[in-house]
């Protein structure tokens, strides 16, 4: 149902990653205005973004309240200019999402090196533990707050004069490894989410070397 | 649902190469890394090395580097091993495996790899 | 590299008896330690990851317990189908290596 002059959005899609959550759709409008509303699957629906005229829609705030529930969005799309217009069914015309899960969905954001310090033998490599959204008695949790020992990185390393690579794995956001003595390491990070079926992996940190200001080097 | 399905088996001459390949379904690989496992006559279980098909890195066991190349083709969702240099003790069933960062949690059912003059 | 030291090599045992085999790492692992169970002219089958969580369809009666570098693997009831080979794997750094293996057979 709908008025004659309205199209129902379509292509409703989730773009998330580390909790930042926007609903995007389709059309562009052309004389009609959208708004959005969510709920989770057992709850009230919560109207956001007022009869606008974008195609996306930020729904963090909403999503961040519980990042372990099922939610629900949809779109409603009004005449321009005629916002209490309903169709023949008494309501305006909407769309709804698929469900989206925030915990088992978002992206897993590109990762960053923070530091690396080398003594002696041993590389300690430290990936940053990214702020999210997410908050708990009005602070922001990092991604490692939110997911726990759900989240591993894995660590790809080189001699920066050769090809062969090594990997480790960790449950924290430091890595301890061997390296050999008088060679210059290149790294790179990648964050995993194990237990998921989807939106596993993150991307590649950018690759960190050794010999560059980011690290720091100590004889021992 | 998980499968691995792993090329037939080889009879190869020593000093000469083989290339063995396992086709993936029922996931995505760039989403896991994946592994090849060596496994002689009556003995243990070998890793030979495992490639991450989202960025392209390998990585090798230091006793194969060099003879060994593992590479993975996300269109065909098929991750390929080849040895070079064959010698007699390369005769083993080889596995491959998916890791999902937490185990090998499924494998194929080996390819046999007979090397012998 | 990490050496993996599994024990004991072979064990004889009954059904009904409870079996354990442990693994013990040269360096810590964090966890990163997962079982296989291995039949004759078959692929491994994957039993325990992340050092103590049963993957699916297996069996109750395995259970995996340890951390740092000392893992166990515990066969509470043991069973027909369970006379097989077991093999740890430590994949917390490269090259990723396995235990020696245990052979259960039946007393």
């Known amino acids: 149902s709908g008025t004659t002059n309205t199209v129902a959005a379509y292509n409703l899609t989730w773009k998330s990653t580390n909790f930042k959550t926007i609903l995007e759709w389709e059309p562009k409008p052309v004389n009609q205005v959208y708004t959005v509303q969510i709920s989770t699957k057992s709850g009230d629906w919560k109207s956001k973004c007022f009869y606008t005229t974008d195609t996306e829609c930020d729904l963090t705030d909403e999503i961040v309240k519980d990042v372990k529930q099922t939610y629900l969005a949809r779109v409603f799309s009004y005449p321009a200019g005629n916002v209490e217009s309903t169709g023949s069914a008494g309501e305006p015309l909407y769309e709804n999402s698929p469900e989206f899960t925030p915990y088992l969905e978002t992206n897993l954001g590109q990762p960053t090196i923070q530091s690396f310090e080398q003594v002696g033998t041993k590389v300690n490599v430290t990936v940053e533990d990214e702020r999210t959204l997410v908050r708990r008695n009005n602070t922001f949790l990092s991604l490692r707050d939110v997911f726990g020992k759900d989240l591993i990185y894995t660590l790809y390393y080189w001699k920066s004069s050769s090809s062969g690579k090594k990997t480790a794995k960790t449950n924290t956001n430091e890595f301890l490894i061997d390296v050999d003595k008088g060679e210059n390491y290149c790294f790179s990070v990648q964050a995993v989410i194990p237990s998921r079926t989807v939106n596993r992996k993150s991307t590649d940190s950018p690759v960190e070397c050794m010999g560059q200001e980011k690290g720091e080097f100590r004889e021992i | 649902q998980v499968q691995l399905l792993e090329s037939g088996a080889v009879l190869a001459r020593p000093g000469t190469s083989v290339k063995i390949s396992c086709k993936a379904s029922?996931?995505?690989?760039?989403?896991?890394?994946m592994h090849w496992v060596k496994q002689r006559p009556g003995q243990g279980l070998e890793w030979i090395g495992g490639n991450d098909p989202a960025n392209g890195h390998s990585m090798y066991d230091p006793k194969f580097q060099g003879r060994v190349t593992i590479t993975a083709d996300t269109s065909t969702s098929t991750v390929f091993m080849e040895l070079s240099s064959l010698r007699s003790e390369d005769t083993a069933v080889y596995y491959c495996?998916?890791?999902?960062?937490?185990?090998?949690?499924?494998w194929g059912q080996g390819t046999l790899v007979t090397v012998s003059s | 590299d990490i050496q993996m030291t599994q024990s004991p090599s072979s064990l004889s045992a009954s059904v009904g008896d409870r079996v354990t085999i442990t693994c013990k790492a040269s360096q810590d692992i964090k966890s990163f330690l997962s079982w296989y169970q291995q039949k004759p002219e078959k692929a491994p089958k994957s039993l325990i990851y992340y050092a103590t969580s049963l993957a699916d369809g297996v069996p109750s009666r395995f259970s995996g317990s340890g951390s740092g570098t000392d893992y166990t693997l515990t066969i509470s009831s043991l069973q027909p189908e369970d006379f097989a080979t077991y093999y740890c794997l430590q994949h917390g750094e490269s090259p990723y290596t396995f235990g020696g293996g245990t052979k259960v057979e039946i007393k």
């Open positions: 495996a998916r890791d999902s960062g937490y185990a090998m949690d499924y």
């Open positions: 029922g996931f995505n690989i760039k989403d896991y890394y």
